[in-house]
């Protein structure tokens, strides 16, 4: 049954009332308000915005709104000693320097405290040497360089284009290859869509625009100095040498005008194939070093950024549940931005603000949700998901016992083509049912449902007539809730057409040009896509907090487990001889998946038939649903990644943004043909199959009849 059975309900107080209260014009106003100055984590401006949001959430009617502060490791450029890269001649003279900052967008020329482009947490250093172009710096790019082309990156400065994978993975790969510095740049092939003007005339990246971002490899640790525990007043902090995930070599980002000057002189090997060529008028030679006439010139990095323990502030709002106040549905998104945050994060924060206002309006009229809803404005997401992770570490005991679901609310848009959803399989049916009830904002789909336009534009690759829903990866604040704590999670936003726009993310991501005007002029002038995202996110929260039976379908987990087992088995079967030699069998995993499928099916039948008027039985069934996600958590975590504990999903070891299924087995199999000790390697594969099979079986048993 749905929400209209919720507590204190009157005909007026249902999902429709909540959705009808959401207004595009309010989201627009909130976005404007949140984007007039920078809100960098750890700054006074972001503290002031936290207090403003606290005050407004109270006005909107939440029961309580508190600030939760932590002292975490952040990173900033040196104000008097700017970071830059130069080309130096044989005498050591700088004959070319990269930009010190981006040219400001129109109307923002007099804004102070715009942080110049930098790679957060880069160590200081002034390495100089020959350049090697490493494409996207993915694992496979370094394989191509080292194994096929026999190019050694040791002692070289590598230049990599942004895109395809998380920048932290690029830096980790470069470090492992022996590089002594990394230059990251935005190639027009990835950040300039054909036929669109650059900002301020369109939504493309100008030549002087640069993507900021952290380059950590935290693997879910949160604050690098206090892994596993909150960075509170009495925290024990590691020394910087023991800090988690910090890069060991200097890193700096540049725009494509500056990249042109570095790449145009490149000599050495030609690019291995066309996939290594971007859109600049340069040869994309790999190097090492510059061509003939310029061979005595070197590249020098000048990096002077500092790491500093700094106070950050989350805003936590509570709307107490009327029936199950000890069950928490969380809606959270970050507040800190690199500069103005026109899209990331404020297009999401503005939507959260309007959702809070709508819930508050209903509450003022006497309504309460069945379960408690927690609203969060996270700090320091851009510096490694720090605010959300520290809060979850501080409240982990409550969350693991009471956490029903977490809905993420970062950027509401990355395009204006169709909906994009990543979530636990438990939420598939919730998302399908909700989007069938919402109107599509898309041109050509007037009067049609969101489900219909979404399915048409982004069809599921497996199931006809259904939309694509992706796996959760990481790179956002749901990470600690899903990957560490096993709380069912989901995220939704409007996206671009991935078929026609192959660029990575959106072109102005993390640049100074991510302004209110970018959104209002080019992405969503009517704020209709923002409103739709508010309806999806808010609608999911409403249903999760209000429906008598939790809107989770465990049968959908059974379906994907079978698909993931088939996939990992087929990867393993690329090595049939070794599987035979080392007696590798997936029987236990397939058996566990079969058992899960049968038990989930029976549970779903019982769910239809049980007496919902019996509060004890209702609570028991809901707890089985709530704790199902938790059952996929292995307390020991994944190998070398103790904070990634979900056995079914983890961020890819090669790209933090992407989700990998059965990650323990996947990583054990990855590049196994190159392992020096095959017996040991295949032994680890067998161990990971065992862990996965056990976990799936154990999870299945949580759905069995209790006695």
């Amino acid at each position: 049954k749905s929400s209209n059975e919720a507590t204190n309900i009157t005909p007026k107080h249902n999902m429709k009332a909540f959705l009808d209260e959401l207004k595009a014009e309010n989201i627009k106003k909130f976005l404007y308000n949140f984007t007039q100055i920078p809100h960098l984590a750890g700054t006074e401006q972001n503290f002031q915005l936290a207090k403003q949001i606290q005050s407004q959430w109270k006005e909107f009617g939440l029961d309580s709104v508190e600030l939760a502060h932590y002292d975490v490791l952040l990173s900033y450029p040196n104000k008097t000693h700017p970071n830059y890269i130069s080309i130096i001649n044989e005498d050591g003279n700088e004959i070319f320097n990269t930009s010190l900052f981006e040219p400001p967008p129109p109307g923002y020329e007099n804004v102070s405290d715009i942080v110049p482009p930098f790679s957060a947490f880069s160590p200081q250093g002034m390495p100089e040497g020959d350049l090697v172009y490493v494409n996207y710096a993915r694992t496979e790019d370094f394989f191509k360089l080292e194994r096929d082309m026999k190019i050694n990156c040791s002692g070289k400065i590598v230049i990599a284009r942004y895109g395809k994978v998380f920048r932290g993975n690029k830096v980790k790969n470069a470090q492992l290859a022996g590089a002594k510095g990394v230059i990251l740049y935005s190639d027009p092939a990835d950040y300039f869509a054909p036929g669109v003007k650059s900002y301020p005339d369109g939504w493309n990246l100008p030549g002087g625009g640069v993507q900021r971002g952290n380059i950590l490899n935290l693997n879910g640790a949160g604050d690098p100095l206090t892994p596993g525990y909150p960075a509170n007043e009495y925290a024990y902090r590691r020394g910087i040498a023991e800090a988690v995930g910090l890069p060991s070599i200097p890193v700096h980002p540049i725009g494509y005008y500056d990249a042109q000057k570095l790449l145009e002189k490149m000599g050495g090997s030609a690019p291995p194939d066309s996939s290594w060529r971007g859109s600049l008028k340069v040869p994309y030679n790999v190097g090492p070093g510059f061509t003939g006439n310029f061979s005595t010139q070197k590249v020098k990095m000048h990096i002077h950024s500092t790491n500093e323990v700094t106070r950050i502030y989350n805003v936590i709002g509570t709307l107490r549940g009327a029936v199950e106040p000890d069950r928490y549905v969380i809606l959270g998104g970050h507040r800190d931005s690199w500069v103005f945050g026109g899209i990331d994060p404020q297009s999401g924060a503005a939507v959260v603000h309007e959702i809070v206002r709508s819930f508050g309006t209903l509450k003022k009229e006497g309504w309460r949700p069945r379960r408690t809803i927690l609203f969060a404005s996270w700090d320091a997401e851009e510096f490694g998901l720090l605010g959300s992770t520290e809060w979850a570490e501080e409240n982990s005991r409550l969350l693991q016992e009471r956490g029903v679901a977490y809905i993420n609310a970062d950027s509401s848009i990355e395009g204006n083509y169709t909906l994009r959803v990543d979530c636990t399989p438990l939420m598939y049916s919730l998302v399908h049912n909700l989007t069938k009830e919402l109107k599509s904002p898309d041109e050509g789909f007037e009067g049609k449902s969101l489900y219909e336009s979404w399915t048409k534009k982004s069809p599921s690759p497996e199931f006809s007539g259904m939309p694509r829903i992706s796996k959760l990866g990481s790179g956002n604040d749901f990470e600690v809730f899903f990957q560490r704590l096993g709380i069912a999670s989901g995220r939704a936003r409007y996206t671009k057409n991935w078929e026609t726009n192959k660029f990575s993310g959106y072109p102005l991501y993390h640049s100074v040009y991510e302004t209110y005007e970018l959104v209002e002029k080019f992405y969503d002038p009517m704020f209709k896509y923002h409103l739709t995202v508010a309806q999806v996110r808010g609608g999911m929260v409403f249903e999760l907090a209000n429906s008598i039976v939790l809107p989770f379908d465990c049968r959908d987990y059974a379906v994907v487990l079978r698909k993931y087992a088939d996939k990992i088995y087929s990867i393993s079967m690329k090595h049939p001889q070794e599987m035979k030699t080392y007696s590798v069998s997936f029987d236990s995993l397939f058996s566990a998946v079969k058992n899960f499928t049968e038990i989930a099916s029976k549970f779903s039948e019982r769910l239809q038939d049980f007496d919902k008027s019996n509060p004890i039985v209702l609570r028991m069934m809901n707890d089985q649903l709530m704790f199902l996600e938790r059952a996929f958590i292995d307390p020991l975590g994944l190998p070398d990644r103790p904070f990634y504990r979900h056995v079914i999903y983890a961020p890819s070891s090669h790209n933090k943004y992407a989700g990998e299924s059965f990650p323990g087995i996947y990583d054990a199999l990855f590049d196994i043909e190159s392992k020096v000790d095959p017996s040991k390697a295949w032994g680890e594969v067998k161990r990971q199959i065992y862990v996965a099979a056990f976990t799936v079986q154990a999870a299945a048993e949580t759905l069995s009849e209790v006695a």
Partner: antibody, heavy 119, light 107 residues
Framework: QVQLVQSGAEVKKPGASVKVSCKAS????????MHWVRQAPGQGLEWMGY????????RYAQKFQGRVTMTRDTSTSTVYMELSSLRSEDTAVYYC????????????WGQGTTVTVSS | DIQMTQSPSTLSASVGDRVTITCRAS??????LAWYQQKPGKAPKLLIH???SLESGVPSRFSGSGSGTEFTLTISSLQPDDFATYYC?????????FGQGTKVEIK
Amino acid sequence: QVQLVQSGAEVKKPGASVKVSCKASGYTFTDYYMHWVRQAPGQGLEWMGYFNPYNDYTRYAQKFQGRVTMTRDTSTSTVYMELSSLRSEDTAVYYCARSDGYYDAMDYWGQGTTVTVSS
Amino acid sequence: DIQMTQSPSTLSASVGDRVTITCRASKSISKYLAWYQQKPGKAPKLLIHSGSSLESGVPSRFSGSGSGTEFTLTISSLQPDDFATYYCQQHIEYPWTFGQGTKVEIK
């Protein structure tokens, strides 16, 4: 090849208006900004403003706000700069110059139009 | 507005000389500085943009350097065709502003 051809010299009385044209050829007209820069006799260069033919946006230097208007005729790939309420200090050579984008330097210039303001 | 100050105002030099002109900005303009050459009765001609990027067709004896607030234009070996007035201009922030010019004349 890229060419910016400006209209001929003008002599105007104080208080009058002048409209100088700049006809572009050899490139896609709407892909480039058009700037106007003036130079008083024996003096340096002074930026007056730009016109963006892609979206008809203009930006004028504070000094000329309210007196200058920049327009276009797409059919002839021509940009116009009109300066009103002329005074003797407006006697100068007026140049149009194009730039690739909002942040790019002016790579091609017109030959200049001499405007003399005299009673 | 950003003030641009050039020095010297006039420079006397001979063919073959190495010539350096300095341009200072009243606040940091990163590397967004252009240099133009103007001959009497002619329109300015772009030599260098973004501090050090040589415009195509401009002889390699012209070079630009600098970052932040201090920039220089260098002519490595002055040629007869180089006697002209040179202007710097910041192209990072509107209104765009020029230096007052440096006249390079024959010694």
